[in-house]
């Protein structure tokens, strides 16, 4: 796991930004772009 302050703070943001290109579980990513966190 990642325990740095950045990973703790932006865990959800990172998950959202990486969600494009693969549909996981029951949710759907659209408008795939590339964001850096």
């Amino acid at each position: 796991g990642c325990n740095t302050a950045t990973c703790v703070t932006h865990r959800l943001a990172g998950l959202l930004s990486r969600s494009g290109g693969m549909v996981k579980s029951n949710f759907v990513p659209t408008n795939v772009g590339s964001e850096a966190f």
Partner: antibody
């Protein structure tokens, strides 16, 4: 300070659509993921989806994917959530929320927009 | 999805009481657990982030603990303004999911 100001309460007929707005101020709009969460009595808090303000990339949960559209207008620092094909179960308070800067979690919330679906 | 189960769903307590609310995740979420307070007509307020971190302005009578699947929110001495509904939320996996809430009422 960060503020999220939402549009007013709506009463809608089943089958119609509603569009809720969330005007952001106090930060650089475009650098964050804006989330949409709803609260319905008996169902609690439910995350619906999110938009990256800068690019318009959206992520929705399957439950709402065919009925929800989340958009953002950088020129007015406003995010929108449109829900179509409304049914009585969509009666809820709809919130926009933003991640905190330095801590995990939704640190900033709008006051909520009550949407009542009734014939 | 990760299911979040809170208990109890409601409790009655008096001012000055120590109150404990538990939250259980259906899978290991490390420490990615946040707690919110919601009052009728108000927006939810972030209290505790990453299991035990205090959000700005949150009184020290609130505290959080746990890791993995089991988490606790404790109010050491309940104050009149603390009567509200409390929700846990996991931020380890998408979609973010919330517990069903614990309503803290006046005894």
């Amino acid at each position: 300070q960060v503020q999220l100001v939402q549009s007013g309460a709506e009463v809608k007929k089943p089958g119609s659509s509603v569009k809720v707005s969330c005007k952001a101020s106090g930060y650089t709009f475009g650098n964050y993921w804006m989330q949409w969460v709803r609260y319905a009595p008996g169902q609690g808090l439910e995350w619906m989806g999110a938009i990256y303000e800068g690019t318009g990339k959206t992520v929705y949960i399957q439950k709402f994917a065919d009925r929800v559209t989340i958009t953002a207008d950088k020129s007015t620092s406003t995010a929108y959530m449109e829900l179509s094909s409304l049914r009585s179960e969509d009666t809820a308070v709809y919130y926009c929320a933003r991640l905190s800067d330095y801590v995990s979690g939704f640190g900033y919330w709008g006051r909520g927009t009550t949407v009542t679906v009734s014939s | 999805d990760i299911q979040m189960t809170q208990s109890p769903s409601s409790l009655s307590a008096s001012v000055g009481d120590r109150v404990t609310i538990t939250c259980r995740a259906s899978k290991d979420i490390s420490k990615y657990l946040n707690w919110y307070q919601r009052k009728p007509g108000d927006a939810p307020k972030l209290l505790i982030y990453y299991t035990s971190g205090y959000h700005s302005g949150v009184p020290s009578r609130f505290s959080g603990s746990g890791s993995g699947t089991d988490f606790t929110l404790t109010i050491s001495s309940l104050q009149p303004e603390d009567f509200a509904t409390y929700y846990c939320q996991q931020g380890d996996a998408l979609p973010p999911t919330f517990g069903g809430g614990t309503k803290v009422e006046i005894k």
